[in-house]
Interface confidence: low
């Protein structure tokens, strides 16, 4: 009688499309890109942490989010050399089961943590610009820190499947040791569930919130400019809003599309080895795009602020932070910020948006 899923050893079988995603140029190009991302990311995000924590003394809601964004990126970046070696060795995993689980969870964790943090940052920008007075009590350092703890817990929860189901397997007829998900062939709910969760929870919902937040900011600022027709219009703010939304969208959309195609393959809707090859070949490339842009996010958001830019350049010139806390750092704003007095509904003031992680 049928005995399904009784092979409990670490041996597994190679498949119908054994060459899918296995190309010499991938084994050279991807490790090279991973190495570049690692160097640039570690350097950039470490400086962001130093600037926000030591120079700017972590005084604003947005700086809390940006600091956590940089820390999440650093957690991911530390595992990137393992993936570079794994790809260079033609998907052979030499680091053991424990590091397989940790490295896999790190990738998943970074995706969710960074996307959730960017979503919260967009909500914070909306509250700061559109409702600066009303949101003052809500936009506190305590709320920001609790929000970050919740985000880390949620990202950790989303990474649990990787910790549980990612394992090192020896593929019998090809003599390859891989770090991969495994699940019963007759029960593909795990890969489908993980893929769709990544699509919906890791992209669709956050993108809709980010889009809504910045659209409402856009409308509020447009309204403010219309009230003061005699004042010169500053189009930079609108360009920055567009840049934020488009940067997020185009960073993640390739990876999300191929993740969805991957789900269709798991479901058996796509049954073509050529498409499987395209998906498996493109996947690491889309990971490079998404995670490289992701690692640039703290710099991208930070450099929108004059103070951040100044401290960052100061740090590059080895100028140490002042021992005394900066008195001119107010707790009100951050990226895409207004002075508290510059309520957009006020017709007496000129909207003076400045993109600061103050």
């Amino acid at each position: 009688i049928l005995n399904s899923s009784t092979e409990d050893g670490i041996k597994r079988i190679q498949d119908d499309c054994p060459k899918a995603g296995r190309h010499n140029y991938i084994f050279v190009m991807i490790p090279t890109l991973y190495s570049i991302i690692f160097v640039v990311g570690i350097f950039g995000n470490s400086l962001v942490v130093i600037v926000i924590y030591f120079y700017m003394k972590l005084k604003t809601v947005a700086s809390v989010f940006l600091l956590n964004l940089a820390l999440a990126d650093l957690c991911f970046l530390l595992t990137l050399p393992l993936w570079a070696v794994y790809t260079a060795m033609e998907y052979r995993w030499p680091f053991g089961n424990y590091l397989c689980k940790i490295a896999s969870a790190s990738v998943s964790f970074n995706l969710y943590a960074s996307v959730f943090l960017l979503t919260c940052l967009s909500i914070d920008r909306y509250l700061a610009i559109v409702h600066p007075m009303k949101s003052r009590l809500r936009r506190t350092m305590l709320v920001a820190k609790v929000t970050c703890i919740i985000i880390w817990l949620l990202a950790g929860l989303a990474s649990l499947p990787a910790i549980i189901h990612r394992n090192v397997f020896f593929i019998e007829n090809t003599n390859i040791t891989v770090c991969a998900f495994h699940y019963e062939s007759q029960n593909s709910t795990l890969p489908i569930g993980l893929g769709l969760t990544k699509n919906i929870l890791g992209f669709l919902f956050p993108f809709l919130i980010i889009l809504t937040s910045y659209t409402l900011i856009w409308k509020a600022l447009k309204k403010a400019y219309e009230i003061q027709k005699n004042k010169p219009r500053n189009d930079d703010i609108f360009k920055i809003i567009m840049a934020i939304v488009l940067f997020f969208f185009f960073s993640w959309i390739p990876h999300q599309i191929f993740t969805f195609l991957d789900v269709l393959i798991q479901l058996g809707i796509i049954r073509d080895c050529r498409i499987a090859d395209i998906v498996d070949t493109a996947m690491p490339i889309t990971i490079c795009i998404a995670y490289f842009n992701n690692c640039l996010n703290p710099l991208f958001y930070g450099f929108l602020g004059k103070k951040f830019k100044r401290y960052f350049l100061q740090l590059l010139k080895y100028i140490p932070p002042k021992a005394k806390s900066h008195s001119n750092l107010s707790t009100k704003m951050s990226t895409l910020s207004y002075r508290p007095s510059d309520n957009v509904s006020s017709s007496t003031k000129k909207p003076a948006p400045c993109f600061e992680v103050e």
């Epitope: 079988i13 119908d16 899918a20 397997f169 991969a180 062939s185 058996g268 498996d280």
Partner: nanobody, 122 residues
């Protein structure tokens, strides 16, 4: 319900031939890659040969050139033609059905038959 049923095993002299058959249920046959594994006494189960839905085949190095795997779609049956048998081919041969369409970086558990004994005497 029996979903994988092997037959054709037996005792054969070294250098002889045998043909193993594996009848699969329609559901499994249409969706899964079919293959043969074997387990000699006191040894681990090892891969012998596999055939995809698209008839792509692969073999263990130890049987290449001697064994041939094929499938008959009309009968939902997979065959393993074993020629030039050696005493070291003595084992219980298992029919296996594994996932229809995983790819190179994702691997799956398998369905197993009950096994059929093949004994090669010298």
């Amino acid at each position: 319900q029996v979903q994988l049923q092997e037959s054709g095993g037996g005792l054969v002299q070294a250098g002889g031939s045998l043909r193993l058959s594996c009848a699969a249920s329609d559901y499994i046959y249409r969706r899964y890659r079919m293959g043969w594994y074997r387990q000699a006494p006191g040894k681990e189960r090892e891969f012998v040969a596999g055939i995809g839905v698209g008839t792509t085949t692969n073999y263990a190095d130890s049987v290449k050139g001697r064994f041939t795997i094929s499938r008959d779609n009309a009968k939902n049956t997979v065959y393993l033609q074993m020629n030039s048998l050696k005493p070291e081919d003595t084992a219980v041969y298992y029919c296996a059905a594994y996932n229809y369409f995983p790819r190179s970086i994702v691997y799956y558990y398998v369905y197993w038959g009950q096994g059929t004994q093949v004994t090669v005497s010298s």
